[in-house]
Interface confidence: low
């Protein structure tokens, strides 16, 4: 069946050195355990994290993300996943694309990560 992929509408903010979580889900929600799920970085499509055949595919990951990512799958049965990136770097700033692939059907959603220097960050308000 067909579905849409939904990511955060607004840029997600993180401080250098912190962890950040990028949520992504399909609508209508359904079990995505058997799907291929992943994040890559446009425009050059470097793989940030890939989940396929029921497990994380570390071998496909871009070197700069090895050991820094974790796919939170506790709600994958409802079609919801979250990518956690540890030790955020300035180079992580920019676009990420999340995708779900069910056999030959694939949909994607774009999201933006803003990375800020903790020494110059002022909380809004």
């Amino acid at each position: 069946g067909q579905f849409r992929v939904i990511g955060p509408r607004h840029p997600i903010r993180a401080l250098v050195g912190d962890e950040v979580e990028l949520p992504c889900r399909i609508s209508p929600g359904k079990n995505a355990t058997g799907m291929e799920v992943g994040w890559y970085r446009p425009p050059f499509s470097r793989v940030v994290h890939l989940y396929r055949n029921g497990k994380d595919q570390d071998g496909d990951q871009a070197p700069e993300y090895r050991g820094r990512t974790e796919l939170l799958k506790d709600a994958i049965g409802e079609g919801k996943v979250t990518l956690r990136i540890r030790n955020v770097r300035f180079s992580d700033e920019g676009g990420f694309t999340c995708f779900f692939r069910d056999h030959s059907y694939q949909e994607e959603a774009a999201m933006e990560l803003k990375v800020e220097d903790p020494f110059y960050w002022v909380s809004p308000g």
């Epitope: 920019g94 994607e108 774009a110």
Partner: antibody, heavy 116, light 107 residues
């Protein structure tokens, strides 16, 4: 069905300007990075520029840096390439391409001829 | 920039032949290697991405292999519609770079 339709090509004198457009349909345009790739007559493919889905990232080939500007209007599902200070060596068919894992869909191309 | 070198630059083959095209990168690009087919007057078409993944709708006679610096595109049984020019492309690093192309002609 994914469709990419380029327009705006034509004959221009050296030093002149052109703006190429690429109208996209059949996919969620705002979810994808987009690129321009060119092909000089009888030659191979050369990447020109890319832009991220929100437009916050742009990249350019050294051969066009400072002369070309890539942009997009997600509300119009349209990709642009503003080309200034054109040179004879910019003569080529310009293709827009959708970025997935690779350039997974291409337009039919628009010919840019730079000649006096 | 990463240089991509294809060989041969052209080849002649017959329908039913097994055809192999190689692509070498000037430095390791992991599996960030894609293959495209282009026919005269037409836009390129993606065949293989990530070195070995077959793009949706592409016939299974096309296959890709390799990692690091050496890659191969194989057409297991050449069909009349396969006569075209084939390009490899790396998207490991900016700028994306293409091979110079391999023209597959009818023998």
């Amino acid at each position: 069905e994914v469709q990419l339709l380029e327009s705006g090509g034509g004959l221009v004198q050296p030093g002149g300007s052109l703006r190429l457009s690429c109208a996209a349909s059949g996919f969620t345009f705002s979810s994808y990075a987009m690129s321009w790739v060119r092909q000089a007559p009888g030659k191979g493919l050369e990447w020109v520029s890319s832009i991220s889905s929100y437009g916050s990232y742009t990249g350019y080939a050294d051969s066009v840096k400072g002369r070309f500007t890539i942009s997009r209007d997600n509300s119009k599902n349209t990709l642009y390439l503003q080309m200034n200070s054109l040179r004879a060596e910019d003569t080529a068919v310009y293709y827009c391409a959708k970025n997935g894992y690779a350039f997974d869909y291409w337009g039919q191309g628009t010919l840019v001829t730079v000649s006096s | 920039d990463i240089q991509m070198t294809q060989s041969p630059s052209s080849l002649s083959a017959s329908v039913g032949d097994r055809v192999t095209i190689t692509c070498r990168a000037s430095q390791s690009i992991s599996s960030y290697l894609n293959w495209y087919q282009q026919k005269p007057g037409k836009a390129p078409k993606l065949l293989i991405y990530g070195a070995s993944a077959l793009q949706s709708g592409v016939p299974s006679r096309f296959s890709g292999s390799g990692s690091g610096t050496d890659f191969t595109l194989t057409i297991s049984s050449l069909q009349p519609e396969d006569f075209a020019t084939y390009y490899c492309q790396q998207n490991d690093a900016s700028p994306n770079t293409f091979g110079q192309g391999t023209k597959v002609e009818i023998k």
